[in-house]
């Protein structure tokens, strides 16, 4: 279900590129290519290259990204490009100036003095932003989302972007100061992962993170199940970062038993996060459960 040809404008192209990047990453990390044949990996990489090349058409002189060249650049979309490209660095040749230029723009143009990242040009395709949609804890959720992207680009861009460590610290300070007031499980999960990556999810914050889990196995808000899959995937990544391997198995089983294999309208974030989290689990967890995820690799016909 996951190998698709990216196409369309700056947002649609990322929607199309997401499942292919995450499928290749998942199968690489879990060493499962022999099930499908290595020639399929090559075909998938070609599609990622195509998506990458097409995305460059929507890169603005400022290094930010937007749906269209003449549209104001989006904080969220630029951060998402950073996130996907950071993962794709190990798969295809990506110009570090493209990636780190976007990082620099996020920090210099979109981060406020209090550490918050602001959005001045929301994406058109709101379905692609997952649980951030209609989120009444927008400052926390968006700041966490951008912070996670920055942390994933840190190794690649630290030398090119001097302000990156300071920006990460500032955003972390904001999340930490406001974490205890969060109401939504989604925001608790995404901000929890951002803080866990920094080693700052501890004490009362860690307690809040863990006790927000429903039945100790999922981070759930009323509404779309897709958002709960996405939130629980962030939470699983946080647990793995914390090396809390006792809490992990029921979370993994819940995600696995949702039988969520990606694809479909509005699935961009859930797809990316569930496969990223389960790949990390199979890599990190001692004595991990072998997961039988239905990753279908039907390459599009030429």
């Amino acid at each position: 279900h996951l190998i698709v040809t990216p196409s369309g404008a700056g947002e649609q192209n990322m929607i199309g590129m997401t499942p292919t990047v995450i499928a290749v990453h998942y199968l690489d990390e879990t060493e499962q290519w022999e099930k499908f044949g290595l020639e399929k990996r090559q075909g998938a990489l070609e599609l990622i290259k195509k998506g990458y090349t097409q995305q460059l058409a929507f890169r603005q002189p400022s290094s930010a990204f937007a749906a269209f060249v003449k549209r104001a650049p989006s904080t969220w979309l630029t951060a998402y490009v950073v996130k996907v490209f950071s993962l794709a660095v190990n798969l295809i040749a990506i110009d570090s100036q493209v990636l780190c230029g976007a990082v620099k723009w996020l920090i210099l143009e979109k981060q406020k003095p209090d550490g918050v990242f602001q959005e001045d040009a929301p994406v058109i395709h709101q379905e692609m932003i997952g649980g951030l949609r209609n989120n009444n804890e927008k400052d926390m959720a968006l700041t966490a989302f951008v912070l996670i992207s920055l942390q994933e680009a840190k190794d690649i861009c630290e030398e090119q972007v001097n302000s990156l460590p300071g920006s990460i610290t500032k955003a972390g300070d904001f999340l930490e100061a406001n974490y205890m007031n969060l109401q939504r499980s989604y925001t608790v999960a995404i901000a929890g992962y951002a803080l866990a990556q920094m080693g700052r999810l501890k004490g009362p914050l860690l307690n809040k993170f863990l006790t927000t889990a429903k039945d100790k196995n999922r981070w759930e808000d009323p509404g779309k199940q897709l958002y709960n899959v996405e939130a629980t995937s962030y939470a699983l990544l946080a647990l793995l970062q914390l090396k809390d391997f006792d809490f992990v198995p029921p979370v993994v089983r819940w995600l696995n038993e949702q039988r969520y294999y990606g694809g479909g309208y509005g699935s961009t974030q859930a797809t990316f996060m569930v496969f990223q989290a389960l790949a990390q689990y199979q890599k990190d967890a001692p004595d991990h459960q072998e997961l039988n995820l239905d990753v279908s690799l039907q390459l599009p016909s030429r």
Partner: antibody, heavy 120, light 108 residues
Framework: QSLEESGGRLVTPGTPLTLTCTVS????????MAWVRQAPGKGLEYIGW??????TYYASWAKGRFTISKTSSTTVDLKMTSLTTEDTATYFC????????????????WGPGTLVTVSS | DGVMTQTPSSTSAAVGGTVTIKCQAS??????LSWYQQKPGQPPKLLIY???KLASGVPSRFKGSRSGTEYTLAISGVQREDAATYYC??????????FGAGTNVEIK
């Protein structure tokens, strides 16, 4: 925290039956609940469980014939259809230990059980 | 369905002695295993969860351990009140979960 099952009785084969588990001292909006049965003189048999949001999980043998549902913040039902003499047993409900997945964190506490007898 | 094979079916021990009960899983279930004690006419009682964690209020003479797919419940310094039937519950997946057949423990 305590649990009590009710609804067990003598029924003829093919008759449907609903058992109810009533909890006190806690709310099912924050707890999981499992059902287990035990035929006279035999071992325990896992049926399934329901999470705090109402999602259900069943043993493969129980799928289709058994339905677990939350009827209020203090009651959970077990609906059984197409009963046979093989279903004669004491039926127990048990909460997930510390509000977690009962298959991982264990089941505690348990109700005293209710006896269902299927006979013609 | 044979998820869990429990041995022995019955055993006896003197007061102060040790009882060992084993459950063999048909495949890897990691820490998805709990142990229960049941006395005649009573519901089961949780002893151990996550293969080795002692449930609240359970005496420390009960110990759960694991080696690969073999799980062990050991009762050291057995007391008269430990006479009961013991069951393991193992879970491969939510729909592939079963109790062992039980072990009847008699205290001499």
């Amino acid at each position: 925290q305590s649990l009590e099952e009710s609804g067990g009785r003598l029924v003829t084969p093919g008759t449907p039956l609903t058992l109810t588990c009533t909890v006190s001292g806690f709310s099912l909006s924050r707890y999981t609940m499992a059902w287990v049965r035990q035929a006279p003189g035999k071992g325990l048999e896992y049926i399934g469980w329901i999470d705090s949001s109402g999602s259900t999980y069943y043993a493969s043998w129980a799928k289709g014939r058994f339905t677990i549902s939350k009827t209020s913040s203090t009651t959970v039902d077990l609906k059984m259809t197409s009963l046979t003499t093989e279903d004669t047993a004491t039926y127990f409900c048990a909460s997930g230990n510390d509000g977690g997945d009962p298959l991982y964190y264990g089941m505690d506490p348990w109700g005293p059980g209710t006896l269902v007898t299927v006979s013609s | 369905d044979g998820v869990m094979t429990q041995t022995p079916s019955s055993t006896s021990a003197a007061v102060g002695g040790t009882v060992t009960i084993k459950c063999q899983a048909s495949q890897s279930i990691r820490s998805w295993l709990s142990w229960y004690q049941q006395k005649p006419g009573q519901p089961p009682k949780l002893l151990i969860y996550e293969a080795s964690k002692l449930a609240s209020g359970v005496p420390s003479r009960f110990k759960g351990s694991r080696s690969g797919t073999e799980y062990t419940l050991a009762i050291s310094g057995v007391q008269r009140e430990d006479a009961a039937t013991y069951y393991c519950l193992g879970s491969i997946a939510s729909d592939d979960t079963a109790f062992g057949a039980g072990t009847n423990v008699e205290i001499k």
